[in-house]
């Protein structure tokens, strides 16, 4: 089959790194300047990538292969092979329109990046709120609050120590 | 422009080597891209191997592992070692860089 399909169509011999030229009748020609082609049988060479502004370059463009982008100190990658940078915000804050804005009281955000979200609700769990959530950190849920009324401990105290040869008082 | 003239090219036993050379002149310097090429008796001219612009070189399925790219910038000349030769490496060699191709030196491999 593979050599079937070469006779048929001469450019599925050019490997990663070429492009079956129309100017030179067909024939396998390396990638030109600045542009690459990852896969064989190509008929166009693309243009490589470049890494500008807000952008950094993380590994460079090759022949076989494009130039992979992420973004400067205080930005984060937004969309698939980091098409987008995005602002960072501090702990605590949320990217808005307007920039970077504080949580609203009972929701956090622990990252550089996404949105604020509403600090858990412990009651649903049946259990109480054991640490306070902050702009930067959610609540921590405790024990049931049943479970913190006087004599309803699911610890069982030890027994009193007792030396041996002695009987209870 | 560039001139580019192959030599090296001569009759060889199967199994045996050869080393082509091509001699650039003209202003290479901003030529990034290097080339050998073959045409073999009524056959297509095809790549062989090459300095992609990144300077790594490459090879054709044909040529991995018996063949060697190499290129002396202080003499201005591109190189193919050609070693374990076979009778289907008869053909026509020519050099190129981007835009220029050389007169070619023939390659003969026969017992």
């Known amino acids: 089959f593979e050599r079937t399909r070469s006779l048929q169509d001469p450019c599925s011999n050019c490997p990663a790194g070429t492009f079956c030229d129309n100017n030179r009748n067909q024939i396998c020609s390396p990638c030109p300047p600045n542009s690459f082609s990852s896969a064989g049988g190509q008929r166009t060479c693309d243009i490589c990538r470049q890494c500008k502004g807000v952008f950094r370059t993380r590994k460079e463009c090759s022949s076989t292969s494009n130039a992979e982008c992420d973004c400067t100190p205080g930005f984060h990658c937004l969309g698939a092979g980091c098409s987008m940078c995005e602002q960072d915000c501090k702990q605590g804050q949320e990217l808005t329109k307007k920039g970077c804005k504080d949580c609203c009281f009972g929701t956090f955000n622990d990252q550089k990046r996404g949105i604020c979200r509403p600090w858990t609700n412990c009651s649903l769990d049946g259990k109480s709120v054991l640490v306070n959530g902050t702009k930067e950190r959610d609540v921590v849920c405790g024990p049931s609050p049943a479970d913190l009324s006087p004599g309803a401990s699911s610890v069982t105290p030890p027994a009193p120590a007792r030396e041996p040869g002695h009987s209870p008082q | 422009a560039v001139q580019l003239v192959e030599s090296g090219g001569g009759l060889v036993q199967p199994g045996g080597s050869l080393r082509l050379s091509c001699a650039a002149s003209?202003?290479?310097?901003?030529?990034?891209?290097w080339s050998w090429y073959r045409q073999a008796p009524g056959k297509q001219r095809e790549l062989v191997a090459w300095?992609?612009?990144?300077?790594?070189?490459h090879y054709t399925d044909s040529a991995k592992g018996r063949f060697a790219i190499s290129r002396d910038n202080t003499k201005k000349t591109l190189y193919l070692q050609m070693n374990s030769l076979k009778l289907e490496d008869t053909a026509v060699y020519y050099c190129?860089?981007?835009?220029?191709w050389g007169q070619g030196t023939q390659v003969t491999v026969s017992s």
């Open positions: 190129n860089s981007e835009d220029s």
């Open positions: 300095f992609a612009w990144d300077n790594i070189a």
């Open positions: 003209g202003n290479i310097f901003s030529i990034r891209v």
